[in-house]
């Protein structure tokens, strides 16, 4: 369960892949599409508001709260829209929603090699946001083999002006 209803911290960042492609968001036919693309030099990177929450693991050996604390994150590229996992379609979608956000909008944050991060579905452990055919998709990861898979690695770059459209 999420420890508190308020995030412990928030940050504005641009999101890019391990291979330095940008994650961009475009309004098309009254809905948002998510793209993975090489940005032209003069084009500004899209920003995402990341809100970080603490969460306890479902079961705790010691029961004293020290054990099993996770860092969860929600990602919002524009006001009232959040990235959500669609586990049936193995897709990542942008949906307009009100708080409290659904579980599909929460991802367990993993720090990775090369100072990258990965986002694991709260609703489907072992399934991560990844890159597939220039789009974001949900990718099942074999923990024993593919934890370093480049297609689930993302970079966060700080954006200093803290307003959020």
């Amino acid at each position: 369960s999420i420890t508190g209803i308020s995030p412990i911290t928030e940050s504005l960042a641009s999101l890019s892949t391990y291979n330095d492609q940008s994650i961009t968001f475009a309004l098309e036919d009254e809905s948002y599409e998510i793209y993975v693309e090489d940005l032209k030099k003069d084009k500004k990177k899209d920003k995402v508001l990341l809100s970080y929450y603490e969460s306890q693991h479902p079961s705790s050996e010691s029961g004293d709260g020290v054990d099993g604390k996770m860092l969860m994150v929600t990602l919002s590229p524009t006001k009232d829209f959040w990235l959500q996992a669609n586990n049936k379609e193995h897709s990542v979608e942008l949906h307009k929603c009100e708080k409290p956000l659904p579980d599909q909008a929460f991802f367990v944050l993993h720090n990775r090699s090369f100072n990258c991060v990965s986002f694991e579905c709260k609703t489907d452990p072992g399934v991560f946001i990844g890159v597939k055919d220039n789009h974001l998709a949900l990718i099942k990861v074999d923990y024993s083999e593919n934890l370093g898979s480049e297609n689930i690695l993302f970079k966060l770059s700080e954006i200093h002006h803290h307003h959020h459209h």
């Epitope: 911290t9 050996e61 099993g68 993993h110 923990y143 200093h160």
Partner: antibody, heavy 122, light 107 residues
Framework: EVQLVESGGNLEQPGGSLRLSCTAS????????MNWVRRAPGKGLEWVSG????????YYADSVKGRFTISRDNSKNTLYLQMNSLSAEDTAAYYC???????????????WGHGTTVTVSS | DIQMTQSPSSVSASVGDRVTITCRAS??????LAWYQQKPGKAPKLLIY???SLQSGVPSRFSGSGSGTDFTLTISSLQPEDFAIYYC?????????FGQGTRLEIK
């Protein structure tokens, strides 16, 4: 009670080797990323190495890369630091420390052992 | 590597005083900064994480603020047990790096 207990510190000659151990209790060790941090006499804290809960990912400070190896045995709730090619600059108190978050180092280190002393001198 | 610079390196204060320690990162680290207290012969103790979150069990006279590159630890009213060395630590990226420490001494 959540506890980390280090052992293995000793007086060693330059060029020698030592293996430090850290035994954990009171929490699910296999979930927790772990670290070694040291403090040399009269100096500040220096992060040495870190390892993921599964042991699949390891990280090192440049000052120890190629000489030190971090590892863990989750069946024994034990963290290790194999230290080779020791020099006087490695003289320090060595602490093992647990990451606050199971999958992220963003939260700092919330549980520390009391430390074990390594002295490298001829 | 990210360099962490603390100031002052030492400070003398009296019980009841308000004390502020600053920490600057050589590049942006979002809010991923932790503060520790270490007393002679003891292990470091986590006080603040994520720049401003108070670690469980730590007295509320300790507070943290900042984001990006500039951070502050404030002790609102010094108690006798607060005299120690304080370290900041960036938790944004490996290698993890600490500030050089601030020694808080009794005036």
């Amino acid at each position: 009670e959540v506890q980390l207990v280090e052992s293995g510190g000793n007086l060693e000659q330059p060029g020698g080797s030592l293996r430090l151990s850290c035994t954990a209790s009171g929490f699910t060790f296999s979930r927790s990323a772990m670290n070694w941090v040291r403090r040399a006499p009269g100096k500040g804290l220096e992060w040495v190495s870190g390892i993921s809960g599964s042991g699949g990912r390891t990280y090192y400070a440049d000052s120890v890369k190629g000489r030190f190896t971090i590892s863990r045995d989750n069946s024994k709730n034990t963290l290790y630091l194999q230290m080779n090619s020791l020099s006087a600059e490695d003289t320090a108190a060595y602490y093992c420390a647990k990451d606050s978050y199971t999958t992220s180092w963003y939260g700092g280190m919330d549980v520390w052992g009391h430390g074990t002393t390594v002295t490298v001198s001829s | 590597d990210i360099q962490m610079t603390q100031s002052p390196s030492s400070v003398s204060a009296s019980v009841g005083d308000r004390v502020t320690i600053t920490c600057r990162a050589s590049q942006g680290i979002f809010s991923w900064l932790a503060w520790y207290q270490q007393k002679p012969g003891k292990a470091p103790k986590l006080l603040i994480y994520a720049a401003s979150s108070l670690q469980s069990g730590v007295p509320s006279r300790f507070s943290g603020s900042g984001s990006g590159t500039d951070f502050t630890l404030t002790i609102s009213s010094l108690q006798p047990e607060d005299f120690a060395i304080y370290y900041c630590q960036q938790a944004n990226s490996v290698p993890i790096t600490f500030g050089q420490g601030t020694r808080l001494e009794i005036k």
